[in-house]
């Protein structure tokens, strides 16, 4: 038995920040779980982890180079990524594991979310603005 994960197909980070919501076919309330976000087609780089435990506060871990926070819903975990760089544009996959209560469960691999990080391009003000309208 596998947990199903739904993610937006694509998100654009205009201000170098993005909210990626991972929606699960499973209620995480009163469960011990580990939700993680993986970068790349092969999911090689784990960039953020949210650990939840019925008896303690949610714990969030960010890999160096990623500024991450996490928020828990009943059937979702939202990863808030900030200070993203253009070269961090990639596909990101949500993963979930539930350890307690038994049985251990994890997810079917999702389709992932392409996060497109747009660089900040400041437009210079024109040297000769046109005549102002009355």
């Amino acid at each position: 038995n596998k947990i199903l994960v739904k993610q937006s197909p694509m998100l654009v980070a205009y201000d170098n920040a993005v909210n990626l919501s991972c929606k699960y076919s499973y209620n995480l309330f009163s469960r011990e779980f580990r939700a993680s976000l993986h970068k790349g087609l092969d999911s090689a780089v784990e960039v953020c982890v949210v650990y939840g435990n019925y008896s303690q506060q949610l714990q969030v871990y960010s890999k160096t180079g990623f500024n991450c926070d996490g928020k828990l819903g009943n059937e979702s975990v939202t990863f808030y990524l900030q200070n993203l760089y253009v070269n961090q544009t990639d596909i990101y996959f949500c993963k979930i594991e539930v350890m307690y209560p038994p049985p251990y469960l994890d997810n079917e691999k999702s389709n992932g979310t392409i996060i497109h990080v747009k660089g900040k391009h400041l437009c210079p003000s024109p040297l000769f603005p046109g005549p102002s309208k009355p």
Epitope: E46, V49, Y51, T64, E97
Partner: nanobody
């Protein structure tokens, strides 16, 4: 809840070697990391080395690179720290830590559980 038990500390002469072990028990996920930190008398606990479960990520403090090697036996849920070319400044209590992060974190705050520590003394 994760329990950590360290062993292998002791007294050794400068230039000598020691191998520390840290056995973890409790509920484990598919990826996590374990690391070694040390604390000398009157000093802060400092990062030494760390390795993740998948063994595809390891990190070392600059002061131990080339002298210490971290490894792990996943079947035994045990992490090892092979220490060679030991110096007087390596004298400290060595602590094993566990984090749910899946990378070899050098950040002390990332570690959720700690062992009781094992003393390493390097003196002539």
């Amino acid at each position: 809840e994760v329990q950590l038990v360290e062993s292998g500390g002791g007294e050794v002469q400068p230039g000598g070697s020691l191998r520390l072990s840290c056995a973890a028990s409790g509920r484990m996920f598919s990826n996590y990391a374990m690391g070694w930190f040390r604390q000398a008398p009157g000093k802060e606990r400092e990062f030494v080395a760390a390795i993740n479960y998948r063994r595809d990520d390891a990190d070392y403090a600059e002061s131990v690179k080339g002298r210490f090697t971290i490894s792990r036996d996943n079947a035994k849920n045990t992490v090892y720290l092979q220490m060679s070319s030991l110096r007087a400044e390596d004298t400290a209590v060595y602590y094993c830590g566990f984090t749910y992060a899946g990378w070899a974190s050098s950040r002390r705050d990332d570690y959720d559980y700690w062992g009781q520590g094992t003393l390493v003394t390097v003196k002539p």
